[in-house]
C-alpha cells in the first residue's frame, strides 16, 4: 500500500479545472525531493506532464501548475481548460524517477451533459436570476399557465397565472408575457439557492391538449479561484457581482464551519484581525470592487467569498464570488518588524523591503486610515511631495540595490500612532504593514540641538550643534537639509570623534554644522541624525529662520561667539582669519565644518562624507495600487 495518498477518482466536465492534492509522509527527504504528475501509457510507461523541477509538457503549457506545500506535506496539481482527451490514468508521486513513491489517480472528463430535445438546460450561479421560457400553441393562449417542479413522480406548482406562488418562491418568482407575444410565457426566479436546482415543467392549458416544456435548472456554487501567495505578501480579491447589485452594500467574508464571517464591508464593518492591513476599493459604478490584504499571515489561508446585500452581510440567494487562498511559508519577502515604537518628540526609522530586482521602482509610504473602507493616502514617495502636516519631519531615503528603503519620521506625536504601508509601483506582493506606536516621552531625547531658537542672519556665520550621547559614539553622525524631495546630507564635523572611545565625555559629544555666509535660501528644516552604513537611527529636527541683518548689529553671531568662548582652546581663536581660504575646498562654499577642525583640505575631505540624495525631485503624489 503506497504511503502517498490522493483522490482515486476525479471527474469533471470539459472546460472546467481540477485541483488534485497529493499527500506524502512528513520527512525531510520527501519535503525536498522532486514531485511529479505523469500519465500512464498502455506500455506501462508513465510520461511526465509536470514536475516540481520546472518541467512542463507541451500539452499542459499555459494551463497547469504543480505547487509543493512542504509545511503541509502536500503538493497540488492544478489543471485548467479540461478536454475529453485528458481522461485517463495518472500518477502523482515523489522521487527522481517516475517509478518511486506514487498514487494512482483516474481522471474522467465528460462532455457537458445533454438532455432530451424538449429539455432546455439553464445553468446559473447562486444568487442570480433565471428566466425560463415556456412555448405554447395558440389554442392555449387564454388557458392557465403554470410552472411546476418535479419531485419524484409528483410535480409541485411553483407559480401559475392565477397568482398562486409556492411559499418558498415568494417574492422570487414571477410569471409574465412580453409585449404582444401570443406563444411564449416566461417565469423569472431570482435569488437562486442550491435547492432550486432540478427539473421544471411549464404548462399552458389542461389535459391532453396542454402544451408542456421541460427545463433543467442547474444552480452552481461558485467555483473558488485558487490564489497562491507568499507569507508577508499581499493579495487582491477582485469582485465583480454584476450591475443588478451595483447599489447594494458589498462585503468580503471568510467561510468557517457554520457561517461566513465578514472581514470588511462598505457599511464600515471590519474584522480587528485585519486592522491596518485591508482596503476595500470600489472599481466602477457597475458594482465592481476589490479588497486588498497586506502582510499575509499563515492563518489568513482559507476560503473567502465576496458578495452584495443591503445589510452588508452574507445572505442566501444573493450573488457571490469565491476564492481559496493558500499562504506559502517559503516566502521571498524578508521578515521585517511589524511594530515600531517611538516616543513623543523622538523619531523612528522604518525599513521597507522591496523586490531587489526592481531597484528603480518608485517607493511610497502611506498612512492607513480606518474610514469605512480603509484608505491609504501617500505621505511621501520617491516622486511624491511630502504631504501637508509632514513638512520638515518626514523623508524617504532610497538605498538602490539594497532591497530596502528607509522612511524617517521625527517630531513624533501620539497622533502619529497607527498603521503605515510600504509600497512600490512595481511588484505588488511587496507591500508591508507597520504599526507605529508612539508613547509619551519620559526622558530627554537622545539628540539635542542648540541653539533651540535658531535664527540666522544673512551674510553672517551660523553654527548649530547637535549633542549626542556616548552610546552613539561609534555611529556616523550627519546633518541634512530637509526639502520636499528628501533630506540632503551636508558636510558637518563631529567633535566627539577626536576623543578616545575609552573616555567618552557625555557633555562634549557634538556634531556641528555651519552656514557661512548665511543666505536667504538657507532657511528651512535641518536634521541631525545618526546612522551605521545604510542603517538609519535616531534623528532630531530644527527649523532655522533666516532674517536680514539689522543696522548696527555685530557681524558675529552671538550664539557662535558664546560657543567659541566656552568651548574653543585659546590657540585656535586665530583660525577665523584663514576660514575664507579653507572654504574653497568645500563642495558648497557656504557649508563647512566647524572652524576648529579645519586643519587642511585632506582632513576636511575625510570629514565631509556627504552621502548622495535622499529621494529624487518633483513629481505628483503617487497612489496606492
Amino acid at each position: 500500500q503506497s504511503p502517498i495518498f490522493g483522490p482515486q477518482d476525479v471527474s469533471s466536465i470539459e472546460g472546467n479545472s481540477v485541483s488534485i492534492t497529493c499527500y506524502y509522509p512528513d520527512t525531510s527527504v520527501n519535503r525536498h525531493t522532486r514531485k511529479y504528475w505523469c500519465r500512464q501509457g498502455a506500455n506501462g510507461y508513465c510520461a511526465t506532464l509536470i514536475s516540481s523541477n520546472g518541467y512542463l509538457s507541451k500539452e499542459y503549457s499555459g494551463r497547469a501548475s504543480l505547487i509543493n506545500f512542504p509545511e503541509n506535506s502536500t503538493f497540488v496539481i492544478n489543471i485548467a481548460h479540461l478536454t475529453q482527451e485528458d481522461t485517463g490514468s495518472y500518477k502523482c508521486g515523489l522521487g527522481t524517477t517516475n517509478r518511486g513513491l506514487f498514487f494512482d489517480v483516474s481522471l474522467e472528463v465528460s462532455q457537458v451533459p445533454e438532455f432530451p430535445n424538449d429539455t432546455h438546460v439553464y445553468t446559473k450561479d447562486i444568487g442570480r436570476t433565471v428566466t425560463i421560457e415556456c412555448r405554447f400553441k395558440e389554442g392555449n393562449a387564454h388557458s392557465k399557465k403554470s410552472l411546476c417542479k418535479k419531485r419524484g413522480e409528483a410535480c409541485e406548482v411553483v407559480i401559475d397565472s392565477t397568482e398562486y406562488v409556492d411559499p418558498s418562491y415568494k417574492d422570487r418568482a414571477i410569471l409574465f408575457m412580453k409585449g404582444t407575444s401570443r406563444d411564449i410565457f416566461y417565469v423569472n426566479i431570482s435569488h437562486l439557492i442550491p435547492s432550486d436546482a432540478g427539473l421544471y415543467v411549464c404548462q399552458a392549458g389542461e389535459g391532453p391538449s396542454a402544451d408542456k416544456n421541460n427545463a433543467d435548472l442547474q444552480v452552481l456554487e461558485p467555483e473558488p479561484e485558487l490564489l497562491y501567495k507568499d507569507l508577508r505578501s499581499s493579495v487582491t480579491f477582485e469582485c465583480d457581482l454584476g450591475r443588478e447589485v451595483a447599489n447594494d452594500a458589498k462585503y468580503l467574508c471568510r467561510k468557517n464551519k457554520e457561517t461566513c464571517d465578514v472581514i470588511i464591508n462598505t457599511l464600515g464593518k471590519r474584522d480587528p484581525a485585519f486592522e491596518g492591513r485591508i482596503l476595500l476599493t470600489p472599481r466602477d459604478d457597475n458594482g465592481r470592487f476589490s479588497v486588498l490584504i497586506t502582510g499575509l499571515r499563515k492563518e489568513d489561508a482559507g476560503h473567502y467569498q465576496c458578495g452584495a446585500h443591503s445589510s452588508g452581510l452574507p445572505q442566501e440567494g444573493w450573488p457571490v464570488q469565491a476564492w481559496q487562498l493558500f499562504v506559502n511559508e517559503e516566502s521571498t519577502i524578508p521578515n521585517s518588524r511589524s511594530v515600531v515604537k517611538g516616543v513623543t518628540g523622538g523619531s523612528v526609522a522604518i525599513v521597507c523591503p522591496y523586490n531587489p530586482k526592481e531597484s528603480s521602482s518608485l517607493k511610497y509610504w502611506c498612512h492607513w486610515e480606518a474610514d469605512e473602507n480603509g484608505r491609504c493616502p501617500v505621505l511621501v514617495g520617491t516622486q511624491a511631495l511630502v504631504q501637508e502636516g509632514y513638512e520638515g519631519r518626514l523623508a524617504l531615503f532610497d538605498q538602490p540595490g539594497s532591497g530596502a528603503y528607509t522612511v524617517i519620521l521625527n517630531q513624533l506625536t501620539t497622533q502619529d500612532s497607527g498603521f503605515y504601508w510600504c509600497l512600490t509601483d512595481g511588484d505588488s506582493r511587496w507591500r508591508t504593514t507597520i504599526e507605529l506606536q508612539v508613547a509619551e516621552a519620559t526622558k530627554k531625547p537622545d539628540l539635542e540641538v542648540t541653539p533651540q531658537n535658531a535664527t540666522a542672519v544673512i551674510g553672517e556665520t551660523f553654527t548649530i550643534s547637535c549633542h549626542y550621547p556616548c552610546k552613539f559614539y561609534s555611529q556616523e553622525k550627519y546633518w541634512c537639509k530637509w526639502s520636499n524631495d528628501g533630506c540632503h546630507i551636508l558636510p558637518s564635523h563631529d567633535e566627539g570623534a577626536r576623543q578616545s572611545s575609552v573616555s567618552c565625555d557625555q557633555s562634549s559629544q557634538i556634531v556641528s554644522m555651519t552656514l557661512n555666509p548665511v543666505k536667504k535660501e538657507d532657511e528651512g528644516w535641518y536634521w541631525c541624525g545618526v546612522k551605521e552604513g545604510q542603517v538609519y537611527g535616531e534623528t532630531t529636527a530644527i527649523y532655522v529662520a533666516v532674517e536680514e541683518r539689522t543696522r548696527g548689529s555685530p557681524h558675529i553671531n552671538p550664539t557662535d561667539a558664546n560657543a567659541r568662548a566656552k568651548d574653543a582652546p585659546e590657540e585656535e581663536a586665530m583660525e577665523s582669519s584663514v576660514r575664507e581660504d579653507e572654504n574653497k575646498a568645500n563642495l558648497d562654499p557656504r557649508l563647512f565644518a566647524d572652524e576648529r577642525e579645519i586643519q587642511n583640505a585632506g582632513d576636511q575631505a575625510q570629514e565631509n562624507r556627504a552621502s548622495g540624495n535622499a529621494g529624487s525631485a518633483g513629481g505628483q503624489s503617487g497612489s496606492s495600487k
Epitope: 482515486q8 476525479v10 481540477v18 461558485p222 481559496q324
Partner: nanobody, 130 residues
Framework: EVQLVESGGGLVQTGGSLRLSCAAS????????MGWFRQAPGKEREFVAA??????????YVGGSVQGRFTISRDAAGNTVYLQMNSVKPEDTAVYYC?????????????????????WGKGTQVTVSS
Amino acid sequence: EVQLVESGGGLVQTGGSLRLSCAASGRTFSPYAMGWFRQAPGKEREFVAAIRWSGATTYKYVGGSVQGRFTISRDAAGNTVYLQMNSVKPEDTAVYYCAADRVPKDISIDPRNPKDWDYWGKGTQVTVSS
C-alpha cells in the same frame, strides 16, 4: 440544525454486499464534502471513503484497506452519499459513521483526518459473519 442520518447497516455474509446511505438535512445545508469512517471495538476511528465536490468537479477518496472493494457516490442534489460495500470481510465489522463538511476546506487538509470534519452522524452497525 444540521443532521446526518445513516441507514443500510446490518448483518451480511463474508463476500456479500451492502449499501449504506447518509442523508444530510438542515434548512440551508448544502454540504461540500461527505465521507465515511468506521470504528471497531477498541480501535481508533478509521477513514473509509470520502467525496468532495466543487461545481461540476467531483473528487473521490478511498482508504487503503478497502480499495477496490468499496466505492462512494452521491445523489444529484448532493445531500445524500452512498457507500457501496462489495466483497466484505469479517474485518469490515464496525460502526460506520457519516461525516460532512459545509465549508470548503483548504484542499491541503487530509480527508483521512477525522478532526477536520465538521459534522457527524450517530453511526450504523455493520456486522460481517463468516
